[in-house]
Amino acid sequence: GSERTCCPVNWVEHERSCYWFSRSGKAWADADNYCRLEDAHLVVVTSWEEQKFVQHHIGPVNTWMGLHDQNGPWKWVDGTDYETGFKNWRPEQPDDWYGHGLGGGEDCAHFTDDGRWNDDVCQRPYRWVCETELDKASQEPPLL
């Protein structure tokens, strides 16, 4: 079958998920497409533990995550509920800042140099992190 029980080559396993860390930059949409073609999605941060893990691997570099607010409320790409979930915004963020001169506000979230989150223009070429969950069924004991 297509069940994934271990991480692909060059991916890092952590807490039953696999992570891939880019070393180049892409616009958010291109990063998102890249992850989907790998059967994954842009990273969805659900806990402080996961935040620390990702932060450790990306270092002090602006890096896209799978969070956007293009259609109103903030949304995680995998459907994880934003309102009740983990958040780690920088103080006074997100601010949908128009002062960058591009106009139109900021609709995609990224890790900043200190790991906390900021909203920014989606077409900026930042690094990104893909995540895919190891098959949950493989955690269950075999049926007798």
Epitope: A27, A29, N33, R36, G103, G104, V121
Partner: antibody, heavy 119, light 106 residues
């Protein structure tokens, strides 16, 4: 509200050139990638070209590569499509469309301008 | 190049549910978007990124994507839903549309 208005269409002979324009209003034009999409009479939609919000990247469909050039003037809130070496198969309604930036889709479209290539 | 396959036509009885499919190799790995086009009008985005509805689009419109098929579902079909519907993806820096499906509401 968001408005996209195409102009510049008309009847042109094969091998000749035409430049289409798309005037944008109601949003900050300089923030968005923009596309041209065309539709031949009675046929389906065909993507033509895209240009990044700052003009830094441009991509084209194979069918127009080397003949069409997409450009923009953010100071004039206008998108352009320069069409050279036109062929009969380029006959279509040409739409400009705005890209939201979240996966290359088109949330607002103009009403289109008809280009007819005929001798 | 990537290809998207749609049925030429789909019919649905008034008030019933219409399903329009869009086939592509491992399409689940791609963001699929759907447009509605009525005669003489420009297309309108009805679903983006597989299942998201733009503001102003009725909840009757929904989308899904798995395996080799993406599906646009229109529940409680109305006469005003009669139109052509196109799926679309992005592949290798190129926009790709399906051939379109004519929805007829009986």
């Amino acid at each position: 509200q968001v408005q996209l208005v195409e102009s510049g269409g008309g009847v042109v002979q094969p091998g000749r050139s035409l430049r289409l324009s798309c005037a944008a209003s109601g949003f900050t034009f300089s923030s968005y990638a923009m596309h041209w999409v065309r539709q031949a009479p009675g046929k389906g939609l065909e993507w033509v070209a895209v240009i990044w919000y700052d003009g830094s990247n441009k991509y084209y469909a194979d069918s127009v590569k080397g003949r069409f050039t997409i450009s923009r003037d953010n100071s004039k809130n206008t998108l352009y499509l320069q069409m050279n070496s036109l062929r009969a198969e380029d006959t279509a309604v040409y739409y400009c469309a705005r890209d939201l930036g979240l996966g290359y889709f088109f949330d607002y479209w103009g009403q289109g301008t008809l280009v007819t290539v005929s001798s | 190049s990537y290809e998207l396959t749609q049925p030429l036509s789909v019919s649905v009885a008034l008030g019933q549910t219409a399903r329009i499919t869009c086939g592509g190799d491992n399409i689940r790995r791609r963001n699929v978007h759907w447009y509605q086009q009525k005669p003489g009008q420009a297309p309108v985005l009805v679903i983006y990124r597989d299942s998201n509805r733009p503001s102003g689009i009725p909840e009757r419109f929904s989308g899904s994507n798995s395996g080799n098929t993406a599906t646009l579902t229109i529940s409680r079909a109305q006469a005003g839903d009669e139109a052509d519907y196109y799926c679309q993806v992005w592949d290798s820096s190129t926009g790709v549309f399906g051939g379109g499906t004519k929805l007829t509401v009986l």
